[in-house]
């Protein structure tokens, strides 16, 4: 094959090599960029910056090598468009630092930075941590800071991510109230901070105020839906990012729903209860307190992490006619109480008979050869035979 005269030449089926001295000053408009998985660049002293726009369209890129070039700066978001990047070799350039944000979100198996005049500072604390934890092949490189000795020896006592304190009201919050949250940010070299409110949806009207180091957030006209929703304050500095999530408890009275009994291998009277704080529950059977046992007891389904409503069953293991009757669920919290009742009939009374029927002599024996009644314990060992959708 004839030698390739261009600045960049194909290498294999999806690779590109750019090794002609000084031919590149940026990575715009590389040929066949959208299908590239490997890009090798060498001897490009004019290539000094690597930014977001440089790698746009290189979505398939897995290996990137830029060596023996003039790279001085890599933007924190440079690799936003190359999420599949797994090997990054930036050795023998002019890099003094590299932000933690640059590699955030990538699953780098290899990161090579040897031969750069790195400047030891808190901004490289993340790289020091990679070295300590044996990540990305960093320990083998024995990285040095220019004129400062090994990266591993860099003092890091003061290199911490921001510290966040979120103040929430300690008084009870009721539906319709306005709630003021304040996020105090402390730390060195603070860069950015803000609120993440993705879970709130229609739970309140949101108004942000203030800026570093004290961020305010007003949640106006809150609803009960705000319960169990995360309100997150975040802040970043050159060391990394910190987040603190809080939840605002909005008080509201207990409510309860009962549904018709359903038969599994056991019986279930499905219920839903709601309220904040979580209501206490009590069952009545025909008006009297029902004492729960291993044959009749309350069983909750796994709660959804982001809502207060709880679903469950009054579970009855092989109930008989003595369990037929009126079941009432009482739910109460400091803001109110509620109840719901349902009639349940599990089995006819074998001792009730019509005078015209033949008189039973004794309790009929069960067919001793029957195997159809054998229950099967599910392999996942959960006592629920089927899921019951309630509410």
């Amino acid at each position: 094959a004839a030698p390739c005269p261009d600045a960049c030449c194909p290498h294999g089926s999806s690779g590109l090599r750019c090794t002609r001295d000084g031919a590149l000053d940026s990575l715009h408009h590389l040929p066949g960029a959208e299908n590239l998985t490997e890009l090798y660049i060498e001897n490009q002293q004019h290539l000094q910056h690597l930014e977001l726009r440089d790698l746009r369209g290189l979505g398939e890129l897995r290996n990137l090598t830029i060596v023996k070039s003039g790279l001085r700066f890599v933007a924190p978001d440079a690799f936003h468009f190359t999420p599949r990047l797994s090997r990054l070799n930036l050795s023998f350039n002019a890099l003094e630092s590299l932000s933690w944000k640059t590699v955030q979100g990538l699953s780098l198996q290899e990161l090579v930075l040897s031969g750069n005049p790195l400047h030891c500072s808190c901004a490289l604390r993340w790289l020091q941590r990679w070295e300590e934890e044996g990540l990305g092949g960093v320990p083998e490189q024995k990285l040095q800071c220019h004129g400062q000795g090994p990266l591993a020896h860099m003092p890091n006592a003061s290199c911490g991510v921001p510290t966040l304190k979120v103040q929430v009201p300690n008084a009870s919050v009721d539906v319709g109230d306005d709630v003021l949250l304040r996020c105090q940010v402390e730390g060195r070299g603070l860069e950015q901070a803000g609120w993440i409110l993705t879970e709130l949806e229609q739970s309140a009207t949101v108004m942000k105020s203030g800026g570093l180091p004290s961020l305010g957030l007003t949640l106006a006209n809150v609803t009960s839906d705000l319960n169990r929703k995360n309100v997150t304050c975040w802040a970043e500095n050159d060391v990394g990012r910190a987040e603190v999530s809080v939840q605002v408890n909005v008080s509201f009275p207990a409510s309860v729903q009962l549904h018709t009994a359903v038969e599994m291998h056991h019986w279930c009277i499905p219920f839903s209860v709601d309220g904040q704080p979580a209501p206490s529950l009590r069952w009545l059977f025909n008006g009297s307190v029902l004492n729960e046992t291993s044959f009749i007891f309350t069983e909750f389904l796994e709660p959804a992490a982001n809502e207060t409503v709880r679903h469950g069953c009054l579970r009855l293991n092989q109930p008989t006619h003595v369990n037929n009757g009126n079941y009432t669920l009482l739910a109460a919290n400091p803001f109110g109480q509620a109840s719901a009742s349902i009639m349940a009939a599990f089995m006819d009374n074998p001792f009730e008979f019509n005078p015209e029927d033949p008189i039973p002599v004794s309790f009929s024996p069960v067919d001793t050869n029957s195997t159809s009644g054998d229950p099967v314990e599910k392999k996942d060992e959960t006592p629920f035979g089927v899921s019951v959708a309630v509410g």
């Epitope: 291998h265 291993s294 229950p375 996942d380």
Partner: antibody, heavy 117, light 109 residues
Framework: QVQLQQPGVELVKPGASVKLSCKTS????????MHWVKQRPGQGLEWIGE????????NYNEKFKNKATLTVDKSSSTAYMQLTSLTSEDSAIYYC??????????WGQGTTLTVSS | QAVVTQESALTTSPGETVTLTCRSS?????????ANWVQEKPDHLFTGLIG???NRAPGVPARFSGSLIGDKAALTITGAQTEDEAIYFC?????????FGGGTRLTVL
């Protein structure tokens, strides 16, 4: 597979207390009730009580109400029975047994408690 | 408290059918008593066999079956085997507590 593991032997002095353990594995501990049963030679089996591992709800045989206290540790999937003011009458084998549906289906191998000075 | 009574001992031969019974001092055993049958083998190895009168526990051989016969709970072993030699305890549920019978020692000769 479902397993209920109990220490083989406990030796304690009269008047003291003891906490017997039943460490479970192979199933979702919090979904089941655990029962405790006493066996004395020549006296058959006596039911002591039951506990719901999910919330610690208990029911006791009247005879053992002031003798036994049942608890659970969800983090280690372990059921416990504390026996207090021990006398020679408490010397016996104590079993934990899992309740599933209408069965006492899986039993521990028992802890032999000896109360002796 | 109720008393639950079982035969103290029974003997059968391999291949034969044998029935063990369980009587309640409070009257007829009913489905509300959720009669359980538990097998004890040497070295204190207990296994639940039958629950709720006639439900076999998972993994229990089909030769074991439970029923109500008259006013008693019954455990029938159809085609007994030598490994069935054991002590069999009946347990009855009385609303909020179990009461065990004294056990039947079954010998398979």
């Amino acid at each position: 597979q479902v397993q209920l593991q109990q220490p083989g032997v406990e030796l304690v002095k009269p008047g003291a207390s003891v906490k017997l353990s039943c460490k479970t594995s192979g199933y979702t501990f919090t979904s089941y009730w655990m029962h405790w049963v006493k066996q004395r030679p020549g006296q058959g089996l006596e039911w002591i009580g039951e506990i719901y591992s999910s919330n610690g709800l208990t029911n006791y045989n009247e005879k053992f109400k002031n003798k036994a206290t049942l608890t659970v540790d969800k983090s280690s999937s372990t059921a416990y029975m504390q026996l207090t003011s021990l006398t020679s009458e408490d010397s016996a084998i104590y079993y934990c047994a899992r309740h599933w549906y209408v069965f006492l289906d899986h039993w521990g191998q028992g802890t032999t408690l000896t109360v002796s000075s | 408290q109720a008393v639950v009574t079982q035969e103290s001992a029974l003997t059968t031969s391999p291949g034969e059918t044998v029935t063990l019974t369980c009587r309640s001092s409070t009257g007829a055993v009913t489905t509300s008593n959720h009669a359980n049958w538990v097998q004890e083998k040497p070295d204190h190895l207990f296994t639940g066999l039958i629950g709720g009168i006639n439900n076999r526990a998972p993994g229990v051989p089909a030769r074991f079956s439970g029923s109500l016969i008259g006013d008693k709970a019954a455990l029938t072993i159809t085609g007994a085997q030598t490994e069935d030699e054991a002590i069999y305890f009946c347990a009855l549920w009385y609303s909020n507590h179990w009461v065990f019978g004294g056990g039947t020692r079954l010998t398979v000769l």
